[in-house]
């Protein structure tokens, strides 16, 4: 038999201890939230909020401007000063809870934990390729706001998610806030609301639509809003909340809430339970049927998918898919599966399931005993009745009231448990060529860039590297600017190329040349590198013979 070169084991063909230095910015405090802006004339910025300060950075992470956002009551607070002479309420530190772009103007809107959760609008002032913030506008009209009716109280100290939608000549803020009894009593934000920014930026229009956890449930029923996004005709919120109102706090599960992005109304507010599971190829005895549940969403991101993954998910290339990283939760018993799993929920399928759920509730024959649900927001009722009514009223439509869809949407881990002990804390998904890549941050301060594919029994790494020596968790917010992603860990912001930080972690020529084309890797004498790093011969097509 002919002699053959011994095969290099797959794991030996790469080294994830290789150090990569990526550009970073030290923010001077724990990064609380971050967002990027790309203008239409090549101007761009990264906005980074820490306690009492907002940094404006260039795309190279060099500081352009810095603004004091607190403490409230401090004469040096630049945003507070925009609200005129005080006092404006209790003094204290400002933790930025919301940092969003109002793309139509364009402007940056920041909302903090101080000053009743009010927001500030910062017009963007392009200066060449840099962006400066104009003097902030205070989105708060003192004489319009009371503790029980406060259109300008947006952010909750317990956490708020905002998605901005342009409708006609107006911007609507879709706001979701975590509440408890104390927060609800103090210039009460609402759980879910849609607020129109007034054209003169003096605040938000009164009489806005809202849903709130009913006072009797505020103590036990807590909703965490993990992510929000706008795609197509809808705005979506992702929540982690108790599975049952009556057993709250009890076991948690994950829900998707859907709101119309074309009508600022909440009558067609819908919720759907998302179910993510780990189903090992070979099921152990005693393992649950259908796989091990991972009910608690950690992070999420929606993105259009490349051709390969689209085929595996039986959807069209470019369709929008919601990706979520789920964990087992505290009360799930001894874990035999991975720490984190990733599930993919095609948006079109989510919408179809929701629409079918509405039909089941509102079209006869209605299944007896089918509940409208959302008893933490509204009076209990059975379909097709409106909330709180024993029987349908002739002049009210079943469809014009919030509804929890009776079925859940179940998916299994895309990575087949291969993430193992990795605890994923950040996620951003991109499409590169026909490949879909998950860019993940971890609890120990690493970045994993992995191809998303269902059919493999190993992970196809673009990279796996440490952001630094601090080992601090990578935070939930990830932003994109051109070909780079921005991750935050501790007090640092890092700029990570979408195609990976480099190729040096591929140790063999064969492995190097099998890397995805978008990575730009080639063999360079005795190492894997990119063409610009390679003074000598650089080869992308074939390897030199092994002697």
């Amino acid at each position: 038999k002919e002699w053959q070169c011994p095969r290099t084991p797959y794991a030996a063909s790469r080294d994830f201890n290789v150090k990569y230095m990526v550009p970073s910015f030290s923010a001077g405090g724990l990064v609380q939230t971050m967002v990027t802006y790309q203008g239409d004339k090549n101007e761009s910025a990264v906005f980074v909020a820490i306690r009492n300060r907002l940094h404006v950075l260039g795309p190279d992470l060099k500081s352009v401007q810095s603004l004091a956002t607190g403490p409230a009551g401090d004469p040096g607070c630049q945003t507070c000063a925009a609200c005129g002479p005080g006092p404006h309420g209790p003094s204290g530190d400002t933790d930025t809870k919301v940092l969003v772009l109002e793309p139509a103007l364009p402007a940056l809107v920041s909302c903090g934990s101080s000053l009743q959760g009010r927001c500030f609008l910062h017009d963007l002032d392009p200066q060449g390729t840099a962006v400066h913030l104009a003097a902030p506008a205070c989105l708060f009209s003192a004489h319009h706001n009371r503790p029980d009716d406060c259109p300008d109280c947006v952010a909750s100290p317990l956490g708020t998610r905002v998605t901005v939608v342009e409708q006609g000549q107006a911007s609507y803020f879709y706001v979701a806030s975590s509440l408890d009894a104390a927060v609800a009593a103090s210039f009460s934000p609402r759980s879910v609301s849609i607020r129109r920014l007034k054209a003169d930026a003096s605040g938000f229009a009164p009489g806005f639509v809202a849903l709130s956890v009913l006072p009797k449930h505020l103590v036990s029923y807590s909703i965490e809003y993990v992510h929000s996004f706008h795609t197509g005709a809808f705005v979506y919120f992702l929540t982690v909340q108790p599975a049952s109102v009556t057993d709250a706090p009890g076991a948690l599960h994950t829900r998707l809430a859907r709101l119309s992005a074309t009508e600022p109304e909440l009558g067609d507010y819908r919720e759907l339970v998302l179910d993510c599971r780990f189903a090992p190829k070979r099921r152990r005895r005693g393992a649950p049927e259908g796989g091990q549940p991972y009910p608690v969403l950690r992070v999420a991101h929606s993105a259009p998918v490349g051709a390969q993954l689209a085929t595996e998910l039986s959807i069209a290339e470019g369709q929008e898919v919601l990706f979520g990283v789920f964990v087992a939760g505290k009360d799930s018993g001894p874990g035999v599966g991975p720490n984190s799993v990733v599930c993919a929920f095609p948006i079109d399928l989510l919408d179809t399931l929701i629409d079918e759920g509405v039909e089941r509730c509102c079209e006869s024959p209605v299944h007896p005993g089918l509940r409208r649900g959302l008893d933490f927001f509204q009076s209990p009722s059975f379909c097709p009745n409106p909330p709180g009514l024993e029987a349908p009223s002739p002049n009210t439509s079943c469809r014009h009231f919030p509804l929890l869809v009776s079925s859940s949407f179940s998916r299994v881990d895309l990575f087949n448990g291969l993430l193992g002990t990795v605890e994923v804390t950040a996620l951003y998904v991109t499409r590169l060529d026909n490949v879909t890549v998950a860019h993940m941050g971890t609890a120990d301060g690493r970045i994993l860039q992995v191809e998303l594919a269902r059919s493999l029994n190993y992970l196809l790494y673009v990279s796996n590297f440490s952001l630094g020596d601090s080992g601090q968790p990578v935070q939930r917010d990830v932003s994109r600017l051109g070909d780079h992603l921005f991750f935050a860990s501790g007090d640092q912001v890092f700029q990570v190329p979408i195609q990976g930080p480099g190729c040096r972690h591929f140790l063999t020529c064969g492995r190097c040349l099998r890397a995805q084309r978008f990575m730009g890797c080639g063999w360079c004498g005795n190492m894997c590198g990119r063409q610009k790093e390679c003074p000598g011969s650089w080869q992308q097509d074939h390897c030199p013979p092994k002697l």
Epitope: A104, L105, P106, D123, L124, D125, A134, S141, H143, H144, G168, Q169, A170, R196, K198, A199, D200, A205, P206, G207, F208
Partner: antibody, heavy 116, light 107 residues
Framework: EVQLQQSGPELEKPGASVMISCKAS????????MNWVKQSTGKSLEWIGD????????RYNQKFKGKATLTADKSSSTAYMQLKSLTSEDSAVYYC?????????WGQGTLVTVSA | DIQMTQSPASLSASVGETVTITCRAS??????LAWYQQKQGKSPQLLVY???TLAGGVPSRFSGSGSGTQFSLKINSLQPEDFGSYYC?????????FGAGTKLELK
């Protein structure tokens, strides 16, 4: 469909007062400020002021303070503008227009003529 | 108050031509600017808001540009229905002010 229906033309004597109405339909009246704009014959447009029907809060262009008074009736979704101590300078078309980034919705205009 | 200076005051053009109207603000108004068209005896009609966003139903031959203090409205391939008066207006704080107008006439 958003509509703003203004009252008909007015012929007034100098020194008199006039009240113009603007009935809104097709949207939540209290959710948007109502603005008033003046246009003299062959001239440009001038912003008079606005009213927030939810709170009855008003803002005026300094030039029209004391001349115009803005009010709103929530129950009938109608905004009103009273012009007092009329002179020939007040002869113009007056428009109501709904708040927005740019005024997308206008009434048809009310012609006020002041003549002895 | 912010002054809006519009030019030219009047303009003659033929169907099919391209014309540009400019508007200068006396101070930085970022993108808080709208353009209107008004025909004789009619209410003004919103064309552009946020300096460059076309209002619903406005033909794509209209386009707005600029930010800060200098703005322009461009009309490509003039159509018979485009003749009339055009006004710019800022909404960056009160009082809102309009330009003096540009009368676009058929040559």
């Amino acid at each position: 469909e958003v509509q703003l229906q203004q009252s008909g033309p007015e012929l007034e004597k100098p020194g008199a007062s006039v009240m113009i109405s603007c009935k809104a339909s097709g949207y939540s009246f209290t959710g948007y400020n109502m603005n008033w704009v003046k246009q003299s014959t062959g001239k440009s447009l001038e912003w008079i002021g606005d009213i927030d029907p939810y709170y009855d809060g008003t803002r005026y262009n300094q030039k029209f303070k004391g001349k115009a008074t803005l009010t709103a009736d929530k129950s009938s979704s109608t905004a009103y503008m009273q012009l007092k101590s009329l002179t020939s300078e007040d002869s113009a078309v007056y428009y109501c227009t709904r708040e927005g980034r740019g005024f997308a919705y206008w009434g048809q205009g009310t012609l006020v003529t002041v003549s002895a | 108050d912010i002054q809006m200076t519009q030019s030219p005051a009047s303009l003659s053009a033929s169907v099919g031509e391209t014309v540009t109207i400019t508007c200068r603000a006396s101070e930085n108004i970022y993108s808080y600017l709208a353009w209107y068209q008004q025909k004789q005896g009619k209410s003004p009609q919103l064309l552009v808001y946020n300096a460059k966003t076309l209002a619903g139903g406005v033909p794509s031959r209209f386009s707005g540009s600029g930010s800060g203090t200098q703005f322009s409205l461009k009309i490509n391939s003039l159509q018979p229905e485009d003749f009339g008066s055009y006004y710019c207006q800022h909404y960056y704080g009160t009082p809102l002010t309009f330009g003096a107008g540009t009368k676009l006439e058929l040559k």
